[in-house]
Interface confidence: medium
Amino acid sequence: ELCDDDPPEIPHATFKAMAYKEGTMLNCECKRGFRRIKSGSLYMLCTGNSSHSSWDNQCQCTSSATRNTTKQVTPQPEEQKERKTTEMQSPMQPVDQASLPGHCREPPPWENEATERIYHFVVGQMVYYQCVQGYRALHRGPAESVCKMTHGKTRWTQPQLICTGEMETSQFPGEEKPQASPEGRPESETSCLVTTTDFQIQTEMAATMETSIFTTEYQ
């Protein structure tokens, strides 16, 4: 079930998905001056079975100049960007798929793709928010939004994140402070260990941790 609307927009914040639920579609958009190849896919689709998920279809772009037409498929201008976009992640970094069954990783870039990716999310998708550079988080979280189905309609939960300029006051007059709701707290899944000087390898919460320390002298 596709989500009807877009994840909430938070001023001075961007969102990203860590992985994409099966059923998610990614538009095959090309950068200015390029277009989808003739009979090329309109979108990539995250599909899979219980053990493996992957993107079906391949996006391919070709130079618009190779065809005698003025029509181009290009991303919208910066000031009229479609929503449901995430910036390309570069370099592509793999997501721990084993812990996310039924999800696809970020698809690798294709040649001459648009600078913004347009996704069509499905119910259950979670996206994460962070303040853009130069802004700091007020109400430090939970800065995620989930597409949920309620009474036959889809809606995105509201992330509790406000991004404010460093020089701005930390109070917003007349603004109600959202109360955090701790019920959605996930159980601990990850152990994090820093190094020790004697290079111990410890086990904590059933997870083994590798540790290391590096020192460098300034030349």
């Epitope: 997501v95 812990s99 109400h139 430090r140 979280g141 995620e144 955090a180 601990s188 152990s191 994090c192």
Partner: antibody, heavy 106, light 107 residues
């Protein structure tokens, strides 16, 4: 003094990318001090004003490892350095590393 | 930055006592307040998050309350393993800041 140290924090047993990894230090006999943090999925770090320009926090999603590098070390940087995980900067730092003792001496 | 002030800075108590530690924020932080316990040579351990929610695996003798600027950590019946240093921490805004700590010692 004057050198730099890079400490790594490797997580295993679950999803790494969407959690915030914070670095907190504790000087001998002193309290806890937040240095900065990173959410690996975004890659950009936040730093406490006090450490701005001297600390660099990075993360490598492919190895589920976060790094904290502190440069221009001085004697007052002698401390135990912890990494801690928090679910998106709200629920508190629920999983901590065991700590690395960094001693700065000439 | 938001300042967090804990009181008392040290406290002597006996096993079985009811102990209360308070934490005050320099501005309203809603319920964005966490409590940690730290024993010598060990990493801090999260006890309470969101002012009053008990972290998984933490004994129910620990409880937290408060909202806005004033918060309390209560240990209903002190156990031998509870002697440690306790810290409050606000997660309302960046940077997160900690109280100076309350050292709980045996009487």
């Amino acid at each position: 003094p004057g050198s730099s140290v890079k400490v790594s924090c490797k997580a295993s047993g679950g999803t790494f990318s969407s959690y915030a990894i914070s670095w907190v230090r504790q000087a001998p006999g002193q309290g806890l001090e937040w240095m900065g943090g990173i959410i690996p999925i975004f890659g950009t770090a936040n730093y406490a004003q006090k450490f701005q320009g001297r600390v660099t926090i990075t993360a490598d999603e492919s190895t589920s490892t976060a790094y904290m590098e502190l440069s221009s070390l001085r004697s007052e940087d002698t401390a135990v350095y912890y990494c801690a995980r928090e679910m998106y900067y709200y629920y508190g730092m629920d999983v901590w590393g065991q700590g690395t003792t960094v001693t700065v001496s000439s | 930055d938001i300042q967090m002030t804990q009181s008392p800075s040290s406290l002597s108590a006996s096993v079985g006592d009811r102990v209360t530690i308070t934490c005050r924020a320099s501005q309203s932080i809603s319920n964005y307040l966490n409590w940690y316990q730290q024993k010598p040579g060990k990493a801090p351990k999260l006890l309470i998050y969101a002012a009053s929610s008990l972290q998984s695996g933490v004994p129910s003798r620990f409880s937290g309350s408060g909202s806005g600027t004033d918060f309390t950590l209560t240990i209903s019946s002190l156990q031998p393993e509870d002697f440690a240093t306790y810290y409050c921490q606000q997660s309302y805004s960046t940077p997160p800041t900690f109280g100076q700590g309350t050292k709980l010692e045996t009487k």
